[in-house]
């Protein structure tokens, strides 16, 4: 229902002032000598939010971010001067912007920064237990950050640290031209994508990386990278961006002769997020901005939520698309893209595909290939020349679950919470924008689960000045949302039930899965509580059926717009 998606008016629209006055936001407004609070690591066990910023790493208390510790990690004056002499901006570029912040083991984090165009990494001790209250930089042990952090603070790194190995999608050179997916740390030789081959990566911008099991055998585990890149000539007329999902096998150790210390199992596919246009030409949302994986009971099949924007300067729009991993796997098992014919067009490869099929992880599951180094030459040569799949991955229902085209902002971030309500489970999306607002949206099934309606519950301004939201984390334990931007960090509760009004009808009409009428107020709904005493209707928002007190007197026509 695009009309609904486009013109959805929020049930609640809260300004920053209203958020503050109602105690619905806590802000850390940054330090005078820092900025760029972009790199988040949530630690529910220790109840900390670690944040990497310019020259600093913070450890915020999840209960209240006003309570924090900090590590100062600047670059030396010499490094800063070298950076300045290279023609870089002393304030915006010649500092240590933290780009990687990952749990390394039970007691340490691994952190990497741009190091004033000289990437650097180190370990941060956080102790075994929350009560240890340790937060210190291991300044005796610095490592080269090349292939881990970009040189340029404007660029992002998508990273994942598992079993002592760091997977990172980043730029590996000073000029910001050699983009690659790397695996570093650990005991093995570093592995990367093929260099100077636009078929593999074509000026990508990495978004995120995730480990997703493929089967019950951990040998089959794959790491998936989400990124956007320039479409290769012939794939599209004119300069265009494509959103991508890339895969590599966790147990890929490169080839034995060709692709030595390069991925042999790298494959990529296009992610489509589009709506049919009035003239029969689809409107594509190709600029992938963020990805969130919603885990299901089956760890092999999380739902992928992607936030996209349009590439067009004329038409500004944003969309959220959902993808299933079974659809992703189907595409990776489909035809490879192959350049052929008089115009050197991309066509589906129809020749013999070597065995084992390129992109398959070596494991006992698939016929005794114990290592990628054991693959025959023909598998490697095919993999080298066919990194892309021909078919794209279409979203669930073949369309976005939400679009916004009539507003002066674009989506930048997304996190999703699965909420138990009176009439089932609902996914509540928190969407960050480039003007410092957060949209809270619930997906409500209409006739069928596949036909979703988006209900825009709240639009909240979480920073004093309009600023791009560049990081978001959700704590289910604390029921709080944490938001990062250049200006600072904000914290807000996932729900503000009391704001929905003082009557059953208003509470019901809100259609907020977190909230229900308890007989006297609109409050947090807990499925374990005596269900019959609670009034809630997310699917229909029908107070007539659910509010037996006839409490519809609460002016149902007003949308509670705060100004």
């Amino acid at each position: 229902n695009y009309a609904n998606g486009k013109n959805n008016v929020p049930r609640l629209k809260l300004s920053y002032k209203e958020m503050l006055e109602s105690n619905n936001v806590i802000t850390f407004n940054g330090l005078a000598n820092s900025s760029s609070y972009h790199t988040f690591l949530l630690d529910e066990e220790r109840s900390r939010l670690y944040v990497g910023a310019k020259d600093h790493i913070f450890s915020f208390n999840l209960v209240n971010i006003k309570d924090f510790q900090k590590i100062v990690w600047p670059v030396s004056y010499t490094r800063r001067d070298e950076c300045k002499w290279a023609g870089k901006d002393i304030l915006k570029e010649c500092a240590n912007f933290i780009k990687v912040l990952k749990a390394y083991n039970q007691t340490h984090l691994y952190a990497c920064g741009t190091g004033a165009f000289h990437p650097i990494c180190t370990y941060i001790e956080v102790g075994h237990h929350p009560e240890d209250n340790i937060f210190k930089l291991q300044d005796s042990h610095f490592e080269n950050g090349r292939g881990k952090s970009p040189y340029d603070p404007k660029l992002l790194t998508a990273s994942l640290l598992i079993d002592g190995e760091l997977y990172s999608g980043t730029a590996a050179d000073f000029m910001g031209r050699d983009f690659a997916i790397f695996r570093t740390l650990g005991h093995h030789h570093p592995i990367r994508t093929e260099q100077h081959d636009s078929r593999w990566l074509n000026d990508p911008r990495f978004i995120s990386a995730h480990l997703i099991p493929e089967s019950d055998n951990p040998e089959d585990d794959k790491v998936y990278f989400f990124f956007r890149e320039n479409a290769i000539d012939g794939e599209h007329s004119g300069k265009a961006t494509h959103a991508r999902i890339g895969q590599i096998c966790k147990n890929d150790f490169g080839g034995h002769r060709s692709l030595v210390n390069k991925w042999t199992t790298f494959l990529k596919a296009r992610l489509i997020c589009s709506v049919p246009g009035p003239n029969g030409i689809d409107t594509h949302f190709d600029e992938l901005q963020d990805v969130f994986l919603m885990n299901s009971k089956d760890p092999k099949n999380p739902i992928v939520y992607g936030v996209f924007t349009t590439s067009s300067n004329i038409f500004k729009g944003s969309a959220v698309c959902m993808y299933s991993m079974s659809d992703v796997r189907r595409v990776f098992l489909g035809p490879y893209a192959h350049r052929d014919g008089p115009n050197y067009q991309w066509v589906p490869y129809q020749g013999r595909v070597p065995y084992p099929r390129p992109g398959t992880c070596p494991s006992k599951t698939f016929g005794g290939f114990d290592s990628t180094k054991d693959l025959p030459d023909d598998v490697i040569t095919f993999a080298r020349s066919h990194p892309a799949m021909y078919n794209p991955v279409f979203p669930i229902n073949n369309r976005p679950i939400m679009i916004k085209t009539d507003v002066n902002y674009q989506f930048t971030q997304i996190v999703v919470d699965r909420v138990d309500a009176e009439d089932g489970q609902y996914d509540v999306m928190f969407i960050g924008t480039d003007v410092g607002t957060v949209l809270k949206v619930v997906s409500v099934p209409k006739e069928t689960w596949h036909d979703l309606e988006e209900v825009l519950l709240e639009e909240m301004t979480v920073f004093r000045e309009p600023t791009t939201i560049s990081a978001m984390e959700l704590s289910t334990k604390q029921q709080q949302l944490y938001i990062g931007s250049t200006a600072g960090v904000a914290q807000l509760p996932l729900h503000r039930c009391d704001i929905y009004g003082k009557a059953c009808a208003e509470c019901c009409l809100a259609r907020d899965p977190y909230c229900a009428w308890d007989g006297s107020s609109c409050s947090r709904y807990f499925p374990t509580a005596k269900a019959r005493t609670r009034a809630q209707d997310i699917r229909n928002g029908d107070p007539l059926t659910h509010c037996s007190d006839g409490g519809i007197e609460g002016r149902m026509d007003h949308h509670h717009h705060h100004h």
Partner: antibody, heavy 117, light 107 residues
Framework: EVQLVESGGGLVQPGGSLRLSCAAS????????MSWVRQAPGKGLEWVST????????YYPDSVKDRFTISRDNSKNTLYLQMSSLRAEDTAVYYC??????????WGQGTTVTVSS | EIVLTQSPATLSLSPGERATLSCRAS??????LHWYQQKPGQAPRLLIK???QSISGIPARFSGSGSGTDFTLTITSLEPEDFAVYYC?????????FGGGTKLEIK
Amino acid sequence: EVQLVESGGGLVQPGGSLRLSCAASGFTFSSYYMSWVRQAPGKGLEWVSTIIKSGGYAYYPDSVKDRFTISRDNSKNTLYLQMSSLRAEDTAVYYCVRGGQGAMDYWGQGTTVTVSS
Amino acid sequence: EIVLTQSPATLSLSPGERATLSCRASQSIGDYLHWYQQKPGQAPRLLIKYASQSISGIPARFSGSGSGTDFTLTITSLEPEDFAVYYCQQGYSFPYTFGGGTKLEIK
């Protein structure tokens, strides 16, 4: 030094079966792909089969597929070729070869298989 | 399957001369081409791997070149023991195939 010694060749009737063996020494057998290549009298070389290091998968050309089976016993450093439904055109010298993942770098002296009634 | 065509079928030269043997593939095979030498009554032996990589123990007079579809084996100054049959083999894709061979004979 690397040594490959074939055995098991001989005269067999069309439709019959034969099992060739190859005893390997002088290298870590389990670290290499192994192959069989044959040469018909007065003719060129023809690749027959390749088996991967673990023995878990093998490759064949269409000419022998479903009739020949390559296998290996890494604990005995031995390569095998089980041949069934033999035809006159299978008459050849069969070479046991180290390699098949890339180049084939060491060859045995060969064992002769003659298929004739 | 990939067809390898060797030329000439027979090459007659004298010791000390330079031999140039050709192998052409029916499709591009990169550098996945190997050269073997076979003397009468003997097993083949590997001379050159991956189009141009030398093999230890093989005299330096043997060299290989080419990539894609056209490959060459060169023997700079023929020795009496070099007169044999030479085969090329592609390892680009299964089924592996050999060329028909070039017989190098004494003129």
